[in-house]
C-alpha cells in the first residue's frame, strides 16, 4: 500500500502520528498549503495529551493549528468533529474580535504563548505545525 510506516526526516513521531514544527511564519492559508504539499495537514488536537506534546515542542510562540471558522462554524481541517472534540480556548475566546483594524473578524485558531487557544486574523504570519498519521490505510476496518 501507500501508507507511511515511519516519519519523514525532520519530523517527530508521537502516538502513531508525525509532526513537523516550522521555524518561520506564514499566513494560515499558506501554512495549510505547505502541509498539504507535504501530504499532511495542519495539526488537529484531539486530546490533552496531544496538546501537551505540541505545546512542549512549540514553546511560548503563537502557532497555527488546523482549526478555522472561515465558512461559519468552527471546523478541523481533517473533518474531526469540533463540537464533541477536545478544546483548549483561553477564557473569553474565541471572540471573533473586529477591533484589530485589519478588516473582518478572527477566523483561524492558534496556540498562544501559554498553549491555550485564541482566534486571530488568518493573515498573520505565525509559525505552524503539520501532522500526518502513520499507517492511515492499514488502520481502516477490513471490508466485509
Amino acid at each position: 500500500g501507500s501508507e507511511r510506516t515511519c516519519c519523514p526526516v525532520n519530523w517527530v513521531e508521537h502516538e502513531r502520528s508525525c509532526y513537523w514544527f516550522s521555524r518561520s511564519g506564514k499566513a494560515w492559508a499558506d501554512a495549510d498549503n505547505y502541509c498539504r504539499l507535504e501530504d499532511a495537514h495542519l495539526v488537529v488536537v484531539t486530546s490533552w495529551e496531544e496538546q501537551k506534546f505540541v505545546q512542549h515542542h512549540i514553546g511560548p510562540v503563537n502557532t497555527w493549528m488546523g482549526l478555522h471558522d472561515q465558512n461559519g462554524p468552527w471546523k478541523w481541517v481533517d473533518g474531526t468533529d469540533y463540537e464533541t472534540g477536545f478544546k483548549n480556548w483561553r477564557p473569553e475566546q474565541p471572540d471573533d474580535w473586529y477591533g484589530h483594524g485589519l478588516g473582518g473578524g478572527e477566523d483561524c485558531a492558534h496556540f498562544t504563548d501559554d498553549g491555550r487557544w485564541n482566534d486571530d486574523v488568518c493573515q498573520r504570519p505565525y509559525r505552524w505545525v503539520c501532522e500526518t498519521e502513520l499507517d492511515k490505510a492499514s488502520q481502516e476496518p477490513p471490508l466485509l
Epitope: S2, P8, K26, A27, A29, D30, E38, D39
Partner: antibody, heavy 121, light 107 residues
Framework: EVQLLESGGGLVQPGGSLRLSCAAS????????MTWVRQAPGKGLEWVSA????????FYADSVTGRVTISRDNSKNTLYLQMNSLRAEDTAVYYC??????????????WGQGTTVTVSS | DIQMTQSPSSVSASVGDRVTITCRAS???SNWLAWYQLKPGKAPKL??????SLQSGVPSRFSGNESGTDFTLTISSLQPEDFATYYC?????????FGQGTKVEIK
Amino acid sequence: EVQLLESGGGLVQPGGSLRLSCAASGFTFSNYAMTWVRQAPGKGLEWVSAISGSGGNTFYADSVTGRVTISRDNSKNTLYLQMNSLRAEDTAVYYCAKLGKDYHYYGMDVWGQGTTVTVSS
Amino acid sequence: DIQMTQSPSSVSASVGDRVTITCRASQVISNWLAWYQLKPGKAPKLLIYTASSLQSGVPSRFSGNESGTDFTLTISSLQPEDFATYYCQQANSFPWTFGQGTKVEIK
C-alpha cells in the same frame, strides 16, 4: 544519478489537448513533491502546477486552472500534465522539476531539459 | 498574487567582475526565496534556497542575502560559465511566482 526526462510536446491546434510526461529516475519518486514550470518564447519562467508525493494534493496557477490537470503514477515513477482547451499563450517549453527538502523549504533542485509545446493553427 | 520585481533586466560585465542582482517581493515572504540559473538548451539550475543557503555543488562565488522584502544574488567574481539568465522565485504563497529574469552578458 537523479534525472528527469520530459516528453509529449508537439504542435497542437487551439482548443486541442496534449499530455506531457516526465520520467523520473535516481531517487525515491513517491517521497517528493513535483512541479511543472514553463517558459514562453522570449519570456521568463512561469510556475504552472505542483503535486504532493502521494498525488493527493494539487496546486495550479490561475492561468491554467480548469484546463490543466497534474497527476503522477508512483508505480511508474512518472509525472503527467494533461492540457486541454489549449491556447496560443500556452506555447512554451515545459519543464518538470523535483522539489528538494532541506529543513523547511524546498527549492526546485532537479529539472528536466524541457519539452516544447506549440499551439498554432 | 505576490509580485517579484527583479532588477536590472540585463547587465554587461567582464570575467572577474562582482555582479549583484536584486529581487523585491510585493509583500513579506520571510526567507521563502530561491535563485535559479538558466542557459539556452540546458536544464535550469538551483543556486540558492531559503534566500541565502547555497545549493550543494554550486560554487561559493554565488551568495544570497535577504533584507526585509529585498533579496540579492551576488556573484563575487564572474566566471565565463556564469553568463546566463538568473531568476528569483518566491514559495511563500501559491501561486509561486518568478522575477522577470536578469541576463548577465559579456561586456
